[in-house]
Structures are given as structure tokens and as C-alpha cells.
């Protein structure tokens, strides 16, 4: 399975608006997502968009909206004004750089037959989203938690004797039954063949931003969110060399100014392996 | 036509530097990193680092630690190559290369300079 | 660092020959790429991502593999193939090449 997935859908309410969304199912760190239109970027595409997950976001007409949607995915709003609506027929590409390991890219359109609403397949179509997976899973958990609560209290409403009271212990098993799928589904949604993996590693650590980004507009928004985000994250001192566990190791310049927390984080570090991922193109 | 085109021959005293250039033509320059491989006199490929032309920042081989500085000019689209306290075993071919994108569909393709020869000698 | 090693060192086969050329890796790598290079002339891209041919390379050329042992497969030998190939990892920096295997003329 490609590693890149894209998806183009057309608005219910408004036919002249689309949205691409993009995702990187390897593990990795992204430094970089590029969206063009007409072709790959680099060969015949037209940049829409480019997404830095520390430095903002850039984005040309028709592009109206680029944001990320989870630490390995993002959504481009586009605004058609032409009648014949031409995004139809276009081909949107997206392209995830985990510098310096490689750029990874993918293109997908909208197929003729679309309704509007209705989303066209990823491409590739993953059998089941590993984050819907995981939700769906946490969500079965909770109901079957709660019912056996539910159930446990009724059986002590008609009893005497307060023997079988839920115990302490038991909530907490329900407590980790309940967390578990949570990590699960974080650790697949990056790497669907992973084991679950909690630890976190710096995203961008290994690099130099000497310049080229600091005209960006920077919004704490674009900081990727989730469970990643609210994670206490290792505080690092800047030091002119910085060794990571996984033996990455480069140059750490100065990083220009940005709002939202100093690094972001990727819950999908693991190890030495943890950098180029299963990039096969069928 | 993409082209890297490198410096020419250079002839450097031990503790010297030496700056190699590599000159990108035929594509947008920002639109690819550019790696810098060394190869010794009748040895094997090795990694030196990337840079990243669009904004700079640079990735090194830990084994050049302090001793190697890439940088890049996008008003002549090129890239440069220092290294410093030159030792006799620096002495090697040094190749540019255009990164490859791994593009689904897509013709994938990398592109490399000429080669540029440093010799270290005393 | 991630040490390749290929096997053999030299292989001499004939041209129409079926050739075989390993790349063994010190640890677990995702992905391995191969690249020929003639003598006096810089390297080239054969296979990118373990068995995907880069763009114009012959269909002779194959790659295969996971973890730690790569194959590159030419499967019937021309007379423009004798060269040295290398392996490429970069699964974990710094990146690596193996010390080459030389393919000649028998």
C-alpha cells in the first residue's frame, strides 16, 4: 500500500467547493507537506499549498483554507469560481517530506461519477481507517464498561448484603480496558502493523531552519493536535549538536520565533526503524 | 535538461578547506534536496549530508561532525560543499545528487553532478 | 551506524547469465535502495524502496527483500550491465552504502 493517501470531496452545501485530504500512513517524523494541482510538485504540478508543522502554512488561490487534521494529516479547502467547476477533472497531489530521509507522494482526483457529499476513496482504499478503528473499538469498550456497571449496580439495588460491590480494583481494570484502544489506534493510525509504542521523540530535532521561514504566518492552530499535544513533553536544552536515541544525528541551529510548544511530537518513534517507514510504491 | 554541474579539480594542503559547488539547472531549485556523496580512490560510496534548498536546513553525517558546512544560494541555484581541516584520506571524488520524490505513478529519477576531485596532499 | 554488507565482493558471469547480488545489513532496515555506477562516471538510481525500478531502468533489473538480507536480481546479463552495484539504507542516519559488488565479465 502506497504510504500517501489522498482524497478529493465535494461539498453537499456548495458545489464550487472542494476539500483534499491528505495523509502519511509511515512512520516518520513529516517536516513538510506540499498540495499541488495538474501533476506531482517538481514535475508539471501547481503549488496550492505547503504545511510546515512548526512554521505555519502557505497557501495560493484557489486554495482557501490549509490545515492539519491529526500529526500526520492534513485538509485543503479550495473555493471554485469557475462555472464549469474545473476541480472535476484535476488531479491533486500531495507530497510529505520527513527530511532527510525522503518525500513520499500521491495523486488522486475526483471521479466523474461522484455525488456531491460523498467522498472519493482514498487512494489507496484502506480497508478500515486505523483511527476510526480505534474509536470504533474505544467506543465498544466504554458501552460494554458502562453496561457492566449498570449491571453491577441493579444486582446491589436487590441484594442485602454489600458483598459484590464493584471494587476498586475493578474500576481500574475497566479504567485500562477503556485507555488502551486509545493508544492502539494512535500507534496505528502512523504505523498500522505497529506494536503499541507510548514514548514520544522530537520531530524536527534533527534539522536547521537557518532561514526561509520566517515571513510564515504562524498560528498556534496549526499545531498539530491530540493525544501527542497534551503529552508532557521532555524539555531539551539547544546545544550545537543534538544525538537522539535512534542515533539521528545533525546539526541544531537556532529555530526562528513560533508560537505553540518548542517541538512537536510524533507518537511513532521506534528506534533506528522509526525513520523511513514502508515507503513501497505498487 | 536537469543538470548539476560541479566545480572543478582542486589541490588542497592538509588543514586547508575546500568549497565545492554545484550549480542546479532545469527544475526548480527549491523543489529538491541535494545530497553530497564522497568516494575515495577505489572505495565505496559514502553519505556526507543533505540540505534542504528550500529553507536551508541541513542533515550531516556524524562522521564529518564540525568539519562540514552545506550551504545553498537560490538567486544562482546552487549549492555549496565545505570541508575543513583537510586530512589526506579527504582526498576522494565528491558528488552532488538531487534527492529523489517517490511519487505514485510516477516516473522516479535522480540526477547527479559530474564529480569534483580534492585531492589533499602535503 | 547501520553497516551493509553486499556478497560477493566480485562476481564473474557471462553475458545472458542470470546474476544474484546480496546486501546484508547489520540491523533491521525497512528499505533498501541500489544504485550501479560505470567506471568514471557518477552513480545511478536502479531501485528506490527495496523492488520499485527507478525511471528508465530494464525490466531485467529486480530487487527483493525485508529486514536484514536484499537481493538485486539482473535476469538475463547484457554487456551493459558489468559494473559495480551498490546498496543504500536510510532507515536510520547516517545513511549507508555498502562497500560495493563488482559484476565482470567472465
Known amino acids: 500500500t502506497p504510504e500517501v493517501w489522498v482524497q478529493v470531496q465535494m461539498e453537499a452545501t456548495e458545489l464550487s467547493s472542494f476539500t483534499v485530504h491528505c495523509g502519511f500512513l509511515g512512520p516518520g517524523s513529516i517536516s513538510l507537506v506540499t498540495v499541488s494541482w495538474g501533476g506531482p510538485d517538481g514535475a508539471g504540478g501547481t503549488k496550492l499549498a505547503v504545511l510546515h508543522p512548526e512554521l505555519g502554512t502557505r497557501q495560493w488561490a484557489p486554495a482557501r483554507q490549509a490545515r492539519w487534521e491529526t500529526q500526520s494529516s492534513i485538509s485543503l479547502a479550495l473555493e471554485d469560481s469557475g462555472a464549469s467547476s474545473p476541480f472535476a477533472n484535476t488531479t491533486f497531489c500531495c507530497k510529505f517530506a520527513s527530511f532527510p530521509e525522503g518525500s513520499w507522494e500521491s495523486c488522486g482526483s475526483l471521479p466523474p461519477s461522484s455525488d456531491p457529499g460523498l467522498s472519493a476513496p482514498p487512494t489507496p482504499v484502506p480497508i478500515l481507517r486505523a483511527d476510526l478503528a480505534g474509536i470504533l473499538g474505544l467506543s465498544g469498550v466504554l458501552l460494554f464498561g458502562c453496561g457492566y456497571l449498570l449491571h453491577l449496580l441493579r444486582r446491589q439495588k436487590h441484594r442485602p448484603t454489600p458483598r459484590l460491590q464493584p471494587s476498586h480494583t475493578n474500576s481500574q481494570a475497566l479504567t485500562a480496558q477503556a485507555w488502551a484502544p486509545s493508544q492502539a489506534s494512535q500507534a496505528a493510525l502512523h504505523d498500522p502493523y505497529a506494536t503499541i509504542n507510548t514514548s514520544f521523540c522530537p520531530a524536527t530535532l534533527d534539522t536547521a531552519h537557518p532561514n526561509g521561514w520566517a515571513s510564515l504566518p504562524t498560528h498556534a492552530a496549526h499545531q498539530p493536535q491530540g493525544p501527542a499535544a497534551s503529552a508532557s513533553t521532555p524539555i531539551l536544552a539547544r546545544g550545537s549538536f543534538v544525538s537522539v536515541e535512534n542515533g539521528l544525528y545533525t546539526q541544531a541551529g537556532e529555530r526562528p520565533p513560533h508560537t505553540g510548544p518548542g517541538l512537536t511530537l510524533f507518537p511513532d518513534c521506534r528506534g533506528p526503524r522509526a525513520v523511513e517507514g514502508r515507503f513501497g510504491v505498487r | 535538461e536537469v543538470q548539476l554541474v560541479q566545480s572543478g579539480a582542486e589541490v588542497k594542503k592538509p588543514g586547508a578547506s575546500v568549497k565545492v559547488s554545484c550549480k542546479a539547472s532545469?527544475?526548480?531549485?527549491?523543489?529538491?534536496?541535494i545530497y553530497w556523496v564522497r568516494q575515495a580512490p577505489g572505495q565505496g560510496l559514502e553519505w556526507m549530508g543533505t540540505?534542504?534548498?528550500?529553507?536551508?536546513?541541513?542533515s550531516y553525517n556524524q562522521k564529518f561532525r564540525g568539519r562540514v558546512t552545506m550551504t545553498r544560494d537560490t538567486s544562482t541555484s546552487t549549492v555549496y560543499m565545505e570541508l575543513s581541516s583537510l586530512r589526506s584520506e579527504d582526498t576522494a571524488v565528491y558528488y552532488c545528487a538531487r534527492d529523489f520524490i517517490i511519487t505514485v505513478n510516477y516516473p522516479v529519477v535522480d540526477y547527479w553532478g559530474q564529480g569534483t576531485l580534492v585531492t589533499v596532499s602535503s | 551506524q547501520i553497516v551493509l554488507t553486499q556478497s560477493p565482493a566480485t562476481l564473474s558471469l557471462s553475458p545472458g547469465e542470470r546474476a544474484t547480488l546480496s546486501c546484508s545489513a547489520g540491523s533491521s532496515v525497512n528499505y533498501m535502495h541500489w544504485f550501479q555506477q560505470k567506471p568514471g562516471q557518477a552513480p545511478r538510481l536502479l531501485i528506490y524502496?527495496?523492488?520499485n525500478l527507478a525511471s528508465g531502468v530494464p525490466a531485467r533489473f529486480s530487487g527483493s527483500g525485508s529486514g536484514t538480507d536484499y537481493t538485486l536480481t539482473i535476469s538475463s546479463l547484457e554487456p551493459e550491465d558489468f559494473a559495480v552495484y551498490y546498496c543504500?539504507?536510510?532507515?536510520?542516519?547516517?545513511?549507508?552504502f555498502g562497500q560495493g559488488t563488482k559484476l565482470e565479465i567472465k
Open positions: 532545469g527544475y526548480t531549485f527549491t523543489d529538491y534536496w
Open positions: 543504500q539504507q536510510r532507515s536510520s542516519l547516517p545513511f549507508t
Open positions: 540540505i534542504d534548498t528550500s529553507d536551508a536546513k541541513t
Open positions: 524502496s527495496t523492488s
